[in-house]
Amino acid sequence: YDFTNCDFEKIKAAYLSTISKDLITYMSGTKSTEFNNTVSCSNRPHCLTEIQSLTFNPTAGCASLAKEMFAMKTKAALAIWCPGYSETQINATQAMKKRRKRKVTTNKCLEQVSQLQGLWRRFNRPLLKQQ
């Protein structure tokens, strides 16, 4: 999906008002020095591409993020503010239902959510190179 035509300001507002708080809740008890951000993004469409990948695609050691509250709210925000996004996700959602696993918060998941917080941070404040 190409995130170029999303309403970035509406997504940002949704992130600040709810999604960010759910991410903080998920990370509660984790030290702020624990994880270094290794995933980066250069502009808002790129940040949303990375956010979608990290939120909804299962990875080794962390298969369960898509069912977390922050993930469901992220999906809703993208569906509302990115034209045509929900249609592209129907097949992905059906595939996800087939491989549903029980929720387990692993250290790998905590690291992944820390990366997500970093991506959202750059989505909110892209530091464009000065000409």
Epitope: S20, R121, R125
Partner: antibody, heavy 119, light 107 residues
């Protein structure tokens, strides 16, 4: 807990340069932008620029372009702001500030470094 | 660059009063506005981000509203520790700029 510890007060002559340090602790230094803000005596806050400590990318206010250099030393978790060709109007308190978890504000500030430029 | 204008520049009020400070942006900044409180000799402290979100640990008597170009900070019932200078700042795009400040004094 998060702390930004700045270097001490400086007195400089017009035309000289000053380098202010901001040592960060209590968080992952390279994950957050560091901004520099100054405040002249009895005046408001003035944004100077920002650095990404991970990449070294900077963005300076046009007002300070050519006179300011912001750097970061990842090994010591310290950000630096150097201002050259000083003039009396540069006398101010200089603050470093860390961007918040959400990237939508500054949540922690240094205590400020007072610079006096006088002949 | 986006210009931020605050009004009033100074304000006298009493403990218990309801106070409103306004911030105007020279162009649409959506909800990308922050409010800070600063006391003499100290660094600013974050109150509100994203125009209406209360920073953790900030008393609920502080609230923010507005979007686009017009924003307000409201203190519902002034406490003695609230007498300070308040600044808005846009967080829309680099370069960021601050408002002109509003000094809140005891009547």
């Amino acid at each position: 807990q998060v702390q930004l510890q700045q270097s001490g007060a400086e007195v400089k002559k017009p035309g000289a340069s000053v380098k202010v340090s901001c040592k960060a602790s209590g968080y992952a230094f390279t994950n957050y932008l560091i901004e520099w803000v100054r405040q002249a005596p009895g005046q408001g806050l003035e944004w100077m620029g920002v650095i990404n400590p991970e990449s070294g990318d900077t963005y300076y206010s046009q007002k300070f372009q050519g006179r300011v250099t912001m750097t970061a030393d990842k090994s010591t978790s310290t950000a630096y702001m150097e201002l050259s060709s000083l003039r009396s109007e540069d006398s101010a308190v200089y603050f470093c500030a860390k961007e918040s978890l959400t990237g939508s504000s500054y949540d922690y500030w240094g205590q400020g470094t007072t610079l006096t430029v006088s002949s | 660059d986006i210009q931020m204008t605050q009004s009033p520049s100074s304000l006298s009020a009493s403990v218990g009063d309801r106070v409103t400070i306004t911030c105007r942006a020279s162009e649409n900044i959506y909800s990308n506005l922050v409010w800070y409180q600063q006391k003499p000799g100290k660094a600013p402290q974050l109150l509100i981000y994203g125009a209406r979100n209360l920073q953790s640990g900030v008393p609920s008597r502080f609230s923010g509203s507005g979007s686009g170009t017009q924003f307000t900070l409201t203190i519902s019932s002034l406490q003695p520790e609230d007498f300070a200078t308040y600044y808005c700042q846009h967080f829309y795009e680099t370069p960021l700029t601050f408002g002109t400040g509003t000094k809140l004094e005891i009547k």
